[in-house]
Interface confidence: medium
């Protein structure tokens, strides 16, 4: 039904999340999410993942820099809110963004391997 | 925040169970009562895969496993013997069990540790 997530996915506040335990490059992560009919995590706010705010891990999220728009964009083309990561102005625009669920973000080479989070909206 | 599904609001669903992921610390007994008041049980771990998942979500929490003393066996809340290895079991003061980064350990029941609750759908 509309309120069920697929097996091995976490359901929270009408969203489904796949939290990987494997480490992949940013591009590999993006393709893996797409193959599951989802996309790399797009955050609405920094408490979206507060159910795992004690996690020690950083995860690739669906944020990349667009030279064309000179802005950090989510996979759906929307722009990053300046309030989400106050330090985003210091991010290296050649890098990809890894996120820790207690609100920290860092920029790392997109070829580095990290865990990743895919997200599906239920409704 | 929108609410959807079969679990209480602000709980998570995973593999046909609902989980309350606590942020507050309690003793083992207080945690037991807190989960009971939420119509659920102190976290039980059914398999290795579930343990890995929970370790990703939260590095440590009480689980519903205890013993009366170091001379007694580890048991679950429904009185069944708990078969999985619990580290540091030789310490007579540590009679309640904790999930800690992919392994189970014994701890002092009066310690304040984060707790999670679970109920199966």
């Amino acid at each position: 039904d509309c309120c069920s997530c697929q097996e091995k996915w976490v359901g929270y506040r009408c969203n489904c999340y796949f939290i990987s335990s494997e480490q992949k490059t940013w591009n590999e992560s993006r393709h893996l999410c797409a193959s599951q009919k989802s996309s790399l995590l797009q955050l609405q706010n920094t408490d979206e993942l507060d159910f795992m705010s004690s996690s020690q891990q950083f995860y690739w999220i669906g944020l990349s820099y667009s030279e064309e728009h000179t802005a950090w964009l989510w996979e759906n083309g929307s722009a990053l809110s300046q309030y989400l990561f106050p330090s985003f102005e210091t991010f290296n625009t050649k890098n990809c963004i890894a996120y820790n669920p207690n609100g920290n973000a860092l920029d790392e080479s997109c070829e580095d391997k990290n865990r990743y989070i895919c997200k599906q909206q239920l409704i | 925040a929108r609410h959807c599904g079969h679990c209480p609001e602000e709980w998570i669903t995973y593999s046909n169970s609902c989980y309350y992921i606590g942020k507050e610390r309690r003793t083992w007994e207080e945690s037991l009562l807190a989960c009971t008041s939420k119509n659920s049980s102190l976290l039980s771990i059914d398999n290795e895969e579930e343990m890995k998942f929970l370790s990703i979500i939260s590095p440590s929490s009480w689980i519903g496993v205890f013993r009366n003393s170091s001379h007694h066996p580890w048991v679950t809340m429904n009185g069944l013997a708990f078969k999985h290895e619990i580290k540091d079991s030789d310490n007579a003061e540590l009679n309640c069990a904790v999930l800690q980064v992919n392994r189970l350990k014994s701890a002092q029941c009066g310690s304040s540790i984060i707790y999670h609750c679970k109920h199966k759908l």
């Epitope: 891990q57 920290n104 | 540091d88 800690q100 392994r103």
Partner: antibody, heavy 119, light 106 residues
């Protein structure tokens, strides 16, 4: 007893390297994430770097990123800090510290080792 | 980064008196704040974590309170061994420390 003991400090010239070690005893080292923290009279306590219990996650402060690397050998109960391209401002007492179970607080510290960067 | 500002820099009190130390964060850290005690020549020692929980073996005269941006460490009745430097530390966003408050004998 439960303790952490740092070693490897000393006087080193700017631009050179140094490797600090931290020997853990009295607890199951492989269960705990670890940190390095340094202290100077001018800047106080400064967190430097973190490593998860199994070594799979490492984070570094901007002030040392690209120069300092944290690592661990769980079979030897030892934490390391490789410090390259040292600068005068790296002069400090360096502490290793154990991370509390559920992350973020330093519940056990070593006595510290002094690193002096001077020509 | 989150900046923690401690006040006062120095607190001069006599044994038996009550000590109140303040720590203010530049942005909310929820309750993710700890207090440490450091004596000369020694490493810091964890006193309080998550704003108000006493660490193992810490006497009841030490208590912590606060959430968000304003936190307090209270020592209800100073013992001779309590004269030291006290630091606050947050873990809400990476890890940062306050500059310390020295509690000295009056």
């Amino acid at each position: 007893q439960v303790q952490l003991v740092e070693s490897g400090g000393g006087v080193v010239q700017p631009g050179r390297s140094l490797r600090l070690s931290c020997a853990a005893s009295g607890f199951t080292f492989s269960d705990y994430a670890m940190h390095w923290v340094r202290q100077t009279p001018g800047r106080g306590l400064e967190w430097l770097t973190f490593i998860s219990y199994d070594g799979s996650n490492k984070y570094h402060a901007d002030s040392v990123k690209g120069r300092f690397t944290i690592s661990r050998d769980n079979s030897k109960n030892t934490l390391f800090l490789q410090m390259n391209s040292l600068r005068a401002e790296d002069t400090a007492v360096y502490y290793c510290a154990r991370d509390s179970w559920d992350r973020g607080y330093f519940d056990l510290w070593g006595r510290g080792t002094l690193v002096t960067v001077s020509s | 980064e989150i900046v923690l500002t401690q006040s006062p820099a120095t607190l001069s009190l006599s044994p038996g008196e009550r000590a109140t130390l303040s720590c203010r964060a530049s942005q909310s850290v929820s309750s993710y704040l700890a207090w440490y005690q450091q004596k000369p020549g020694q490493a810091p020692r964890l006193l309080i974590y998550d704003a108000s929980n006493r660490a193992t073996g810490i006497p009841a005269r030490f208590s912590g309170s606060g959430s968000g941006t304003d936190f307090t460490l209270t020592i209800s009745s100073l013992e001779p061994e309590d004269f030291a430097v006290y630091y606050c530390q947050q873990r809400s966003n990476w890890w940062t420390f306050g500059q310390g408050t020295k509690v000295e004998i009056k």
